[in-house]
Interface confidence: low
């Protein structure tokens, strides 16, 4: 409903909005200020989002799926703000709002392109399967398709499996990578171009080290500097690989600053910890200590992996008993 | 009651930067989003840029690739970092955050570019 009155028309103009998932936005749209404004945002030009007029909104029509999920700046409007709020987007909202604005002397019509992204945290992981390893680089739930690019010693691979499964609203991807028998660093990359956002997985194999019986053992565990922010949030994991199964040690969380430690000949240094060094020591090793300890540094934007394989061999003590 | 403090406006060279932020408190919900806002003397107020509670960003066209808008892990402080500024940035920049019940505008800082 437009005030029936000599107006100005003003062509449209376009604006491309990007929102994530279950955030808010908001649609922004100006108008000169004037009275008895009419507001009218609608979804692909049919579906109707938000009506406003004679000074409050009017939502009858509104369609259902935008039901208790829109508002206007009330407080505003009078001074030439039609945007509209717009609560938890999700992937179905992407699409052309238009805002066709009224007032006694011109009607304006705004266009914006809302465009939805998706990531959820992505994770590197190692697997053992049968006599196979693998690294894996997985994102559970991203859109639009990201980008996944692998290095090996920071060259560039073409190999490149992708086993992506789509769901309505958005895909879920594993990039499997065989590393049997490499002492090669690997490195992973899953970048999603809308939302501006980048993740890389790295993935460092340690030469293996060789101990007796009651001895300890000193792996380490710093993190890359291109990568590592100490400002971020960060979660460090020590764990060891049993039967093809890990096992967590201990764990740190940067922030709460907290160590928690499952393995009672497991020790931290606490001041390498604050230096970012997150070695740890495994007093009085045993037979049944023998196997791959892995060390994962992880935030929003890396995971950081380095493994370790220890072979724990009787002393000669034990040896002589037999 | 929600208030919005703006600083860090002032007076710049082309081709210099500033750094404005705005603090935010008062609220019982959260900020979803926050922006800036600029109006030039005798012109419409127009959005500047926008940043969702994850840190999504919006840019109006005339700044993209100049201004970056960011906030802080509590979500309670924004910033605008404005490179490369030009004589058409001149303007007094309000800071805006919307909870789900309501906008908020702050009192606003001049910037002013000139050689």
């Known amino acids: 409903i437009f005030p029936l009155a000599f107006f100005i028309y003003v062509p449209m103009n376009e604006q491309i909005v990007i929102g994530r998932l279950d955030e808010d936005i908001i649609l922004p749209s100006s108008f000169e200020r004037g009275s008895e404004v009419v507001i009218h945002w609608k979804y692909q030009d049919s579906y109707k989002v938000h009506s406003y007029y004679k000074g409050s909104d009017h939502l009858e029509s509104q369609d259902p799926r935008y039901a208790n999920r829109t508002s206007l700046f009330y407080n505003e409007i009078q001074n030439g703000n039609a945007s509209l709020f717009f609560r938890r987007v999700s992937l179905l909202d992407e699409g052309i709002y238009t805002c066709y604005v009224g007032t006694a002397i011109q009607v304006i019509t705004n266009k914006v392109v809302l465009k939805v992204g998706v990531f959820l945290t992505p994770v590197m992981k190692y697997e053992k399967r049968n006599t196979n390893s693998f690294l894996i680089c997985s994102v559970l739930s991203v859109y639009p398709r990201p980008i996944i690019t692998w290095k090996m010693d920071n060259t560039p691979i073409s190999e490149n499996n992708m086993e992506e499964t789509g769901s309505l609203d958005s895909f879920s991807i594993n990039s499997p990578l065989n590393i049997t028998g490499s002492n090669s660093s690997y490195e992973c990359t899953i970048e999603n171009s809308l939302l501006k956002q980048t993740w890389t997985g790295r993935w460092t194999m340690k030469d293996g080290l060789h101990k007796m019986q009651s001895e300890h053992v000193s792996l380490s565990c710093q993190p890359v500097n291109d990568y590592f922010s100490p400002n971020q949030d960060f979660k460090v994991t020590w764990s060891r690989m049993k039967s093809g199964t890990f096992s967590v040690l201990a764990y740190y969380l940067s922030s709460s600053q907290n160590t928690i430690i499952n393995e009672s000949r497991f020790s931290w240094n606490k001041e390498l910890i604050n230096q970012s060094d997150f070695s740890m020591n495994l007093m009085d090793l045993n037979l049944s200590d023998s196997g791959e300890y892995l060390c994962n540094i992880s935030s929003d934007e890396y995971t950081l992996l380095t493994i370790h394989t220890v072979h724990v061999e009787p002393s000669q003590e034990t040896a002589s008993h037999n | 009651d929600v208030q919005l403090q703006e600083s860090g406006g002032g007076l710049v060279q082309p081709g210099g930067s500033l750094r404005l932020s705005c603090a935010a408190s008062?609220?019982?919900?959260?900020?979803?989003?926050m922006g800036w806002h600029r109006q030039a003397p005798g012109k419409q107020r127009e959005l500047v840029a926008l940043?969702?509670?994850?840190?999504?960003?919006n840019y109006a066209d005339s700044v993209k690739g100049r201004f970056t808008i960011s906030r802080d892990n509590a979500g309670n402080t924004m910033y605008l970092q404005m490179n490369t500024l030009k004589p058409e940035d001149t303007a007094v920049y309000y800071c805006t955050a919307t909870t789900p019940v309501g906008q908020y505008w702050g009192q606003g800082t001049q910037v002013t570019v000139s050689s």
């Open positions: 940043i969702s509670s994850g840190g999504t960003a």
């Open positions: 008062g609220s019982r919900f959260s900020f979803n989003v």
